[in-house]
Amino acid sequence: MAPWPELGDAQPNPSKYLEGATSQQPITPDKSKETNKTDNTEVPVTKFELLPTYSTATLIEEPTEVDDPWNLPTLQDSGIKWSERDAKGKILCVFQGIGRLILLLGFLYFFVCSLDVLSSAFQLVGGKMAGQFFSNSSIMSNPLLGLVIGVLVTVFVQSSSTSTSIVVSMVASSLLTVRAAIPIIMGANIGTSITNTIVALMQVGDRSEFRRAFAGATVHDFFNWLSVLVLLPVEVATHYLEVVTQLIVESFHFKNGEDAPDLLKVITKPFTKLIVQLDKKVISQIAMNDETAKNKSLVKIWCKTFTNMTQMNVTVPSMANCTSPSLCWTDGIQIWTMKNVTYKENIAKCQHIFVNFHLPDLAVGIILLIISLLVLCGCLIMIVKILGSVLKGQVATVIKKTINTDFPFPFAWLTGYLAILVGAGMTFIVQSSSVFTSALTPLIGIGVITIERAYPLTLGSNIGTTTTAILAALASPGNTLRSSLQIALCHFFFNISGILLWYPIPFTRLPIRMAKGLGNISAKYRWFAIFYLIIFFFLIPLTVFGLSLAGWPVLVGVGVPVVFIIILVLCLRLLQSRCPRVLPKKLQNWNFLPLCMHSLKPWDAVISKFTGPFQMPCCCCCRVCCRVCCLLCGCPKCCRCSKCCQDLEEGQEAQGVPVKAPETFDNITISREAQGEVRAPDSKTECTAL
């Protein structure tokens, strides 16, 4: 199947991907165009053409050319300058600022907490199944199977540290070799990048914001996939990670370290442990083929227990099972012996919501999954809104310049490496790459950080999470110290190798180009984002898993033709874009194939048919929520609540009302003027920094 042409251009002319758009201009009746598509639904529109806008300012200015969609939006100032304010206005402005900061930190706190609860929810829903993936004996001989198990388990439990710790305990108890563990670690690295991709989906409401956010999130995915694509075969052929880490581990003089510092967890744990607490050992026990663990609940009930060793009389099948002949006796029917038994005395119950409900793990998991996703979504929306109202004027300019500007020549190349260090440092502080990259995603979306800058920050985040793992390894008990350190180092060197591959030379920064390509497609066909997520994190790994279980002949039989077709398509695509004259006329484009094999349009039509019936209920809900939001934020009455509310938009447009919700950074004054609603700014309106 040929690729869709949209993949080709990372930064095409917007007219190519914003259907029906030519240039940015005021909305005027246009007889020439019969239909217009602003979304993935095909609704016939007569007389008027809805054009995508990037700022309400352009609605009342002379026509301008559409900017490159990847350029950051101009964060316009909508308030009175500090110098023009009276004392009351200044005090009010300061309090507004403090209030916003408190709100921002509050929502950020709940955002991080919801990520933690989301991870717990995934573990409750899929943790036991994930544990069973590990108990597959084929992992030893099949690195590809190890890789997909790493991906699937991490996706199911939403935590690479959980899957890594399972691998560590399996290596420590000789159930797994370090060689077999390396592909699993690589897979865990891929799996952990799903979190920020899910977070990016929350910004689906605005095309340009979603384009940036989704590309910013998937740059992490592409880096990990590409690294594995190159480094897994290299590792299988040379075992360089195993050898290098073995040498390092052997040169260490081991002493059990202190516990790895819990930095962000110190703040979030008091809250998250009131929601739910899990017994993580259960997943590890399942992975290690412990039959008793399969019936255990992951939800922790007893938090304070007393373990005591006592000698107990136990029955044994025969004298051969006696601990020693002198410690064996009979009651005339059964044979008894003395055994050292550790018994757990439950002292105090945990203090979380689900402790007394005795619900099955799946039920608790689903409840938490829904709640955490709602909180995550709500917090994200509010963070974006607050940031939007704060990051205006000179504040925005300063922040954007600080983050996105390079060092002066000749040290410009160092900027990216500093960003890598910043990413690593920040991840070390928050103790989770998922949290850091998820927090980065909305900032990319609203245009504070460019993808080019987000890329090294994300790479740094990958390094940061491995340094945390190394510290944790150094603090682990003697029996697991060696194996956990070696695995943590494998993880570290894998990420270092990946950075060396895909960062130093600008030409090799493929993940950026691929992410931008995907961002463009996803902005145009938003369903494709979910499609991508399902294919890359579930379908492909599950297919490889299934084929691997069927054995090498089946895997090779299916895999080789697929890989061959992919390479053929890529070569053809390269020739089409670079030197099409080399190719016969028929192969210079994809038109020789059926439309559904080289364009998403037919698929879009099919999906629109299926999603159509759900759009109106969604729209109503959306509109109610949006109206409430608009009242709180002081938005205009004609707020464009949802892209699926086309009937509303068209009705208003027919009356000559420009339908456009003010973007987070749009000039509210201008958009109000457009609606004949201009109010004199008073001391209560937006405040701007000096």
């Epitope: 009389n313 004298m319 002198s326 006796w329 009979t330 009651d331 005339g332 029917i333």
Partner: antibody, heavy 120, light 107 residues
Framework: QVQLQQPGAELVKPGASVKMSCRTS????????MHWVKQTPGQGREWIGA????????SYNQKFKGKATLTADKSSSTAYMQLNSLTSEDSAVYYC?????????????WGQGTSVTVAS | DIVMTQSHKFMSTSVGDRVSITCKAS??????VAWYQQKAGQSPKLLIY???TRHTGVPDRFTGSGSGTDFTLIIRSLQSEDLADYFC?????????FGSGTKLEIK
């Protein structure tokens, strides 16, 4: 209190069989193992076997397998021992006894014993 | 089967004496040994189990000791009501086996 009641004496002909009872009271019948012990002036005391009334599980001294059969009736809280193909060597006092010290074979309650005489 | 041997069939004693009754097992029985007292015309009565644990209601003048193969029952200060037959039992292996008994008589 715990009581094990056995019939005082049984007179049987050689080759015949006898089924002696041990009626219990004062405790939960199905809880403890019921042991049977044979006592003769010449041979001393010999353990015949034991039954766990709760499940009907039995254990025999190899010497008495085929000779003795142990049963228990939960409804009447009574244990039985049947001795087959009696000979003069089977003449003895037979005790039923229970061990309430659960995991041990030390028997702490004994019946009064049934004196079996095998004579023609 | 494990054979429990009580070397003395009879022991002549006086009231107030310290009496030691011995029992030897043919193989290691750990501490799975019990001691019984049987008076003429009566059923046996448990005195000691687990070699040295006194059964409820047994006077403290009765003590047991030993392990492995050699076991002893000691009556610290013999009373007239203690004149009876004393036998040991092992419950280390099936079948349970008893000693032949030691009868205490007045000199």
């Amino acid at each position: 209190q715990v009581q094990l009641q056995q019939p005082g004496a049984e007179l049987v002909k050689p080759g015949a069989s006898v089924k002696m009872s041990c009626r219990t009271s004062g405790y939960t019948f199905i809880t403890y193992n019921m042991h049977w012990v044979k006592q003769t002036p010449g041979q001393g005391r010999e353990w015949i076997g034991a039954i766990y009334p709760g499940s009907g599980d039995t254990s025999y001294n190899q010497k008495f397998k085929g000779k003795a059969t142990l049963t228990a009736d939960k409804s009447s809280s009574t244990a039985y021992m049947q001795l087959n193909s009696l000979t003069s060597e089977d003449s003895a006092v037979y005790y039923c006894s229970i061990s309430t010290i659960i995991t041990t074979g030390a028997v702490d309650y004994w019946g009064q014993g049934t004196s079996v005489t095998v004579a023609s | 089967d494990i054979v429990m041997t009580q070397s003395h069939k009879f022991m002549s004693t006086s009231v107030g004496d310290r009496v030691s009754i011995t029992c030897k097992a043919s193989q290691d029985v750990g501490t799975a040994v019990a001691w019984y007292q049987q008076k003429a015309g009566q059923s046996p009565k448990l005195l000691i189990y687990w070699t040295s644990t006194r059964h409820t209601g047994v006077p403290d003048r009765f003590t047991g000791s030993g392990s492995g193969t050699d076991f002893t029952l000691i009556i610290r200060s013999l009373q007239s009501e203690d004149l009876a037959d004393y036998f040991c039992q092992q419950y280390s292996r099936i079948p349970l086996t008893f000693g032949s008994g030691t009868k205490l008589e007045i000199k």
